[in-house]
Each structure stands twice: as C-alpha cells, then as structure tokens.
C-alpha cells in the first residue's frame, strides 16, 4: 500500500531544485566505488581507477585529486596476460582506510598484481595535505583483489587490516586475511568448501561483545555458494562470519590460521501462499545502527533474489544477541559428503570453538594455547547450525513489482515530534535513491515501512556501489561506475506549501512550522510545529 | 622424524592399471594436505595431484585427469595414487609429498618427499 | 615445457659464487607468488633448499639464498663446495590448473 512514493524526482527535476550535485568522473577514470567518509576532516575519499578523491563535504564540485596509475610495463604485463586493457589493467582501488590520525591506507587490484600505499592527510584539516607516500609501496596480496570485478570488505583497526578477498590471480583462493602489523599473515582455512565457498564479500565491523577489549570480534558479511548438502542443487546463501579479534592462530593444523571463525546464515524471506518461503538470499549491502549501546547495533540488510525468473529486493533487520545466540548455538554436523547437515550433538571441547580468549569467559591467554580438541574440532566445524532469522521473521521492506533492485543502503536515525524513527536511503541497480521510513506499529520492531522519496542521482541509469551518510552535514554521498553524487538528506519544501501536505507526508526531518514545511529541529520551542510520522493525521495537527 | 614411504609401483602395460601407496609416520597425517609429484627418467619435476586434510579438496594435473584418482585414509596415515590407462608418458619416479605451507603467503612448497616408487609403463 | 625456465646447467669452481635464474610470467611468479627452490642430490629425492622466496629450513647452510624480483627468481650459492653438485629447481603456486609448476631444473656442477 505505500509502494507509491510521496515524492518521485528526476535527475532533470533533482538539478532543477538544487537537490543534487554531481561529480560526473574524470575521461581517465572510474568505478567510484570505494568509500571513506571522515566527519572530522569534512572530507569524503573515493577510490577509483587509477585515482584516489577527497571531496569536500560541503560540496563535492570541491576536490583534490591523486593519480595512481600502474607503470607501463605493468599494464603490458597483464595485456599479455589476455586481460582486458581498459577494464582490467589498471590500478582499481578496493581498500581506503584510516590508517592513522595522519595517513590513510589504500591498496588498488595494480593491473592484477595488487598493490598497497599509504596517503599522508595531514594532522589537522588546514594543513591541506593530501600525497601519496612514493617511497613506500606493499604487496597488496591478501588485502585487495587481482580481479577488479571481485568483491572485497575490509577493516583497518589497530594497524591490522581484515579483508575478505581473493589472494591469488585466477580468483578463486577466498579468503579471510589478517595482515600489516607485526604478526604472521592470518587466514581461513584453504582448500576447504565448509569454511569459505566462492563467497562474495560484503562488508567488516568491528563490535565489542563486553566491556573487556580482548572480547573484541570482527564480523564479516557475505554471500557465498550454499555447500553441498545444504541445499538441493546450487544456491546462495548470506553469511555473518565472526572472528576474534585477538585470534592468532592455533598450532598443528591451525598455525596461522584463524582458530575462532565461525559462520552463520542470515535468513531473509518472506512465507509463499504455497507454503514455500521465498528467499532473499543475494546480501547485496549491509549498514550497522550504532545507538546508545555500541555492542548491539542494529544490522541492517539489503538482499535481493537469486532466480532470473522472479526478481525480487527486500531489506532485513537482525540484532546482535540474536547473532550471539545462533553462534551459541549448535554446529553444523555431516559425517560425510553424501550425509545431510546435522546439529551436532556429540561433547563440544573446552574452550567452546569460536570464544576469544580472554579473561571475561576462558582461563585461557592465547589461541596458541588452544587444547588440540578444541582446533580438531573449530577446523571441521566452521558453520553453525541455526540460521540467523531478522527481527520480527519478516522484511522491513520489500519490493517485487519493480524493473530495479537494492544495491546499498545507509540508515540515519531521526528525531521527531512523536519519537525516534529511522530513515533508510537505498540505493538501486538502476541509479534511484529511495527514501523509506519505519514506523513502529504496536512494538517497535513490529514495523511499517512508508516511501517517502524516490530520486534519480544519475543522469545516466547506472548501478549504485556505495553509500555514505553525513549527519553532520545532513547529506547524502552516492556513488557509482560514472561519478559521485550529492544530495541533503530532505527537501522539506518540495512537499508542499500547506500544513496538510507536510503532514501527511510522514517524513521524520520535516514539519509545518507555521508558515512552511521546513526542518524539524527537536530543541526548537515552537509551538507551532506540526509533524505526525506515526500516523500521517493532518486534522488532528492542522488546526488552520 | 617426518618420513613418507612410497610403495606399489613396477612395469605394467599401456592401458594397465597401478595402485601407489605412501605410508606416512613422524607427525600428524591428517594435518597435512598431501601430493604426488613424478619426475620422468631424465627430466624435471611435474606436480600430478594433491588432496586436502579432510579430502574436501582435490586437484589433478590435466595430464593425468580422468585416469589418476587420489585419495587418503588418516586412519592409516596412508595416502594412495590409483594409476588407470596407463600410458607410455606416465613412466617416472613417483614421489609423495607433504604441503608445508611455511611462506607468509601460504603458497604451497613441498618440505619433505618420499624416497619415490618408480612406475614403467611399457609393452 | 617447463612453465618456469631455468638454465639447464651452470658451473663453478670451489669457493665461487653462482647463481640460478628463474624466469615465469604475471600469472605465476609476477603474481606475487612465492617461489620456493630444491635441491636433489644424484639418486635421492628432491628436498627443500628455500622457501617464501628468501628463506632457509633449519639445516640449511647460509651459503644458499634466494630472492625474487618481478616475473623472476635467484638462487645463489656461495662458497661453492663439491657436495652442491645437484639438481636445482624453482616452484611457484599457479592456481589451480595447474595447482603448483616447477621450473625445467638446472644442473649445477662444480669444477675440478
């Protein structure tokens, strides 16, 4: 019933109305898909082809720029190698982190021989520095991708970088790696279908499970083939992985290799009339809900079908005990490949496979220190049993009738006169935003999702790869194959010129202030505000 | 002390069929990924097949798919090369060996090898 | 045809120096992938003379180092003794058709 859009605008319209600003890509470069938002800076970094972006916040039309090519004989070296000129041979950047509070880290596919550098940003925003270290260039096998059409999720804390991606030329040894730092390179186990199959990497978090750091886990999420077993013929599956922080490797057959990694499956779907439910397997993006309590964030999922008959975009919500809960759970089991996947019911080793080590829940120091049952055991037993099902056993959103599906999504947690509400941006295959509000019916994850907006941010149709959020400049960075867009995060005005008009479009950042529809500032004492989200009901609100 | 003991090669005809065998001891078996490696009289080494811990994965030279099978029992430490269709370009010295995964990057290298079973296909 | 080439054969005399070539391409060695060298003394198996491009197992004598570069590999061996007299050979994961290659070998022989 709220398919309908309050608003629907054109690229034409959005121009018009000076609610976008586009960056429309350099002749040289590309693939603006790497993201690295810093508030603080004002900046946004971009990696792309052969470039690397720092656009001010403000606005984008303000940019400084590096160019990072690979040499000549790099770029003949992978032509020779039958690899596509243009497409392929080039520098694509994948990884852009915070390294410090004066460099970043980047790391680019080098022509398909990856390739890693540091970017000096200057202690404070004044000094204006943005430079590539020249002196200083790593191997970037294990952190970014040889192939640019691979997926790669990555996280920088601590000087050790996490990134899920291909380690080797021909795309096919995933994996999750632990490197910098002053440690051995870790990483999942290879050769082996059970932990990793063929994933497609989404993206890291880091998320505290208590107050004690040495509990830290990094989360990765993913999709990945579904084994054998697991389901009847070939299908995908999405996946929360968790890895202790402070794992480094066990001994005998785990040396460097992670000994807490687990793995879940991420349910999305909706029940059929047939009794069949229909699945939303292709986690496409996923955005993390920080509020009040950082250990138990919200996850936010964007899913999509994986049936070329039945196209299909839903996005899920799933909290973080729950997560725990299903890690706490039983093992996947099988006694050979042509076995079903069982719980295992047999005795779990002391200390339970995938718990850090740590003084909060093990007497244990060091994975090292890991009794040889317990790595026997986290080798063959990466996957849990149970899958992880979204609050409320249903989508928030989802949209079957539609030529596009989700691509991103970014969530904003908005005050208004009746409550907090979040916000979803979500990003298409086809270069539309929409913006979609959940409304707490009964309880509040019991939810009802209304399109407030749906916007065109390219003037071309093209796929949205990444998303970022400023609340401190209340807007909106998009971005995609051609450029980089822009655009506030409301357009309270364009809803209309009377009290009713505001009001019924339920949009949390905007109210009647008397004389328009503008901002809602929760500490502005006006009495005259106007705002029903929950309900929508302009005569209760609208006395004039 | 790793050791590895190849047995079961000897002279069979083209189109014949052979079973090797590699009894492992000195540390633990089912640990390891494992392979067969042939050098052919006079020439350099060819990687044929190589088989993970748990058999979950398993790789062939194209040369030899289809006709070779590896397989492992950890019960017995036992890691085994059946040989079918044998042809005259399959003579060599057949030498098993264990992955040692030693480098930073875990490529694979082959730290320890078998003394080898040589294997002559000839009418 | 070896994947990986190497000279078929070097010499030197006692107490020199020599070093080995290994030459691949951007989807073996120029991949960023470790080379690994053996040694296989007449009538014995292969065994594992460096690993990781520049590493020794223990026993290894320190007159024996390796180093990559781009598509290409080293080995050098100083302080040349009699019992060097081997068969040498470069390794490089390939992933995965074929899994692993090895280079064509190279003959060292010592002089005198």
């Known amino acids: 019933k709220n398919n309908v859009p309050r608003l629907k605008l054109s690229y034409k319209e959005m121009l018009e109305s000076n609610n976008v600003i586009t960056f429309n890509g350099l002749a040289n470069s590309s693939s603006y898909h790497t993201f690295l938002l810093d508030e603080e800076r004002s900046r946004l970094y971009v990696g792309a082809k052969d470039h690397i972006f720092s656009f001010d916040l403000v606005n984008i039309k303000d940019f400084q720029k590096i160019v990072w090519p690979v040499s000549y004989t790099r770029r003949d070296e992978c032509k020779w190698a039958g690899k596509d000129i243009l497409k392929e041979c080039a520098n694509f950047i994948k990884v852009l982190k915070a390294y410090n509070q004066t460099h970043l880290y980047a790391c680019g596919t080098g022509a398909f021989h990856p390739i890693c550098t540091y970017i000096e940003i200057g202690h404070h925003p004044e000094d204006n520095i943005f430079k590539l270290e020249n002196s200083h260039f790593e191997n970037g096998r294990g952190k970014s991708p040889y192939d640019p059409k691979l997926l790669t999720a990555s996280l920088l804390i601590d000087g050790e970088l996490y990134s899920g991606t291909a380690a080797d030329f021909m795309g096919r040894d995933f994996a999750i790696f632990r490197t910098l730092g002053h440690h051995h390179p870790i990483r999942t186990e290879q050769h082996d279908s059970r932990w990793l199959n063929d994933p497609k990497f989404i993206s890291a978090h880091l998320i505290s499970e208590s107050d004690n750091p040495e509990d830290d886990k990094v989360y990765f999420f993913f999709r990945e083939n579904a084994i054998d077993g697991e389901h009847s013929g070939k299908a995908t599956h999405a996946r929360i992985g968790q890895i202790c922080k402070n794992d480094f490797g066990g001994h005998r057959s785990l040396v460097n290799k992670w000994t807490t990694f687990l793995k879940a499956r991420l349910i999305c779907s909706v029940p059929g009339p047939n009794g069949i439910d229909t699945h939303f397997d292709e986690l496409q993006d996923v955005f993390l809900m920080n509020f009040k309590d950082p250990k138990n964030p919200v996850v936010y999922g964007v899913f999509t079908t994986s049936s070329n008959i039945f196209k299909g975009s839903a996005v899920c919500m799933y909290s973080m005990s729950d997560v725990r809960r299903v890690f706490l759970g039983p093992y996947a089991h099988r006694d050979g490949p042509n076995y079903q996947w069982v719980p295992y019911q047999g005795r779990v080793p002391y200390p339970r496979p995938g718990t850090c080590p740590s003084k909060t829940f093990g007497g244990f120091d060091s994975t090292k220190d890991l009794p040889d049952d317990v790595i026997t055991f986290a080798r063959s037993h990466p996957a849990m049993y149970n899958p992880v099902f979204p609050m409320n056993n249903r989508p928030i959103v989802i949209k079957t009738d539609v030529n596009y599906q989700f691509t991103q999504i970014v969530v904003d947690r908005v005050d208004a006169e009746d409550g907090q509400y979040d916000v979803m941006f979500i990003g298409t295959d086809v270069g539309t935003v929409l913006k979609v509000v959940s409304i707490p019916k009964e309880t509040w994850y019991d939810l009802e999702e209304v399109l407030l907006e749906e916007m065109t941010v390219f003037r071309e149709p093209t796929a949205i790869s990444a998303m970022e959020l400023s609340t401190k400049q209340q807007q909106l960075y998009i971005g995609s194959t051609a450029g980089v867009a822009q655009l506030p995060l409301h357009r309270c005005d364009i809803y209309g010129k009377a009290c009713a008009e505001c009001c019924l479009a339920r949009d949390p950042y905007c109210a009647w202030d008397g004389s328009a529809c503008s901002r809602y500032f929760p500490t502005a004492k006006r009495a005259t505000r106007a705002q029903d989200i929950r309900n929508g009901d302009p005569l209760t609100h609208c006395s004039d | 002390e790793v050791q590895l003991l190849e047995s079961g090669g000897g002279l069979v005809q083209p189109g014949g069929s052979l079973r090797l065998s590699c009894a492992a001891s000195?540390?633990?078996?089912?640990?390891?990924?494992m392979n067969w490696v042939r050098q052919a009289p006079g020439k350099g080494l060819e990687w044929v097949s190589g088989?993970?811990?748990?058999?979950?994965?398993?790789d062939y030279a194209d040369s030899v798919k289809g006709r070779f099978t590896i397989s492992r029992d950890n019960s017995k430490n036992t890691l085994y090369l059946q040989m079918n269709s044998l042809r005259a370009e399959d003579t060599a010295v057949y030498y098993c060996?264990?992955?040692?995964?030693?480098?930073?990057?875990?490529?694979?290298?082959?730290?320890?090898w078998g003394q080898g079973t040589l294997v002559t296909v000839s009418s | 045809q070896s994947v990986l080439t190497q000279p078929p054969s070097v010499s030197g005399a006692p107490g020199q120096r020599v070093t080995i070539s290994c030459t691949g391409s951007?989807?073996?060695?120029?991949?960023?992938?470790?080379v690994h060298w053996y040694q296989q003394l007449p009538g014995t198996a292969p065994k594992l003379l460096i690993y990781?491009?520049?590493n020794r197992p223990s026993g290894v004598p320190d007159r024996f180092s390796g180093s990559k570069s781009g598509t290409s590999a080293s080995l050098a061996i100083t302080g040349l003794q009699a019992e060097d007299e081997a068969d040498y050979y470069c390794?490089?994961?390939?992933?995965?058709?074929?899994?692993?290659?090895f280079g064509g070998g190279t003959k060292l022989t010592v002089l005198g």
């Open positions: 951007s989807s073996n060695i120029g991949a960023g992938y470790d």
């Open positions: 088989i993970s811990w748990n058999s979950g994965w398993i």
């Open positions: 060996a264990r992955s040692g995964y030693s480098s930073s990057w875990f490529d694979p290298d082959f730290d320890y």
């Open positions: 990781g491009n520049s």
């Open positions: 000195g540390f633990t078996f089912d640990s390891y990924e």
């Open positions: 390794q490089s994961y390939a992933g995965p058709n074929p899994y692993v290659v």
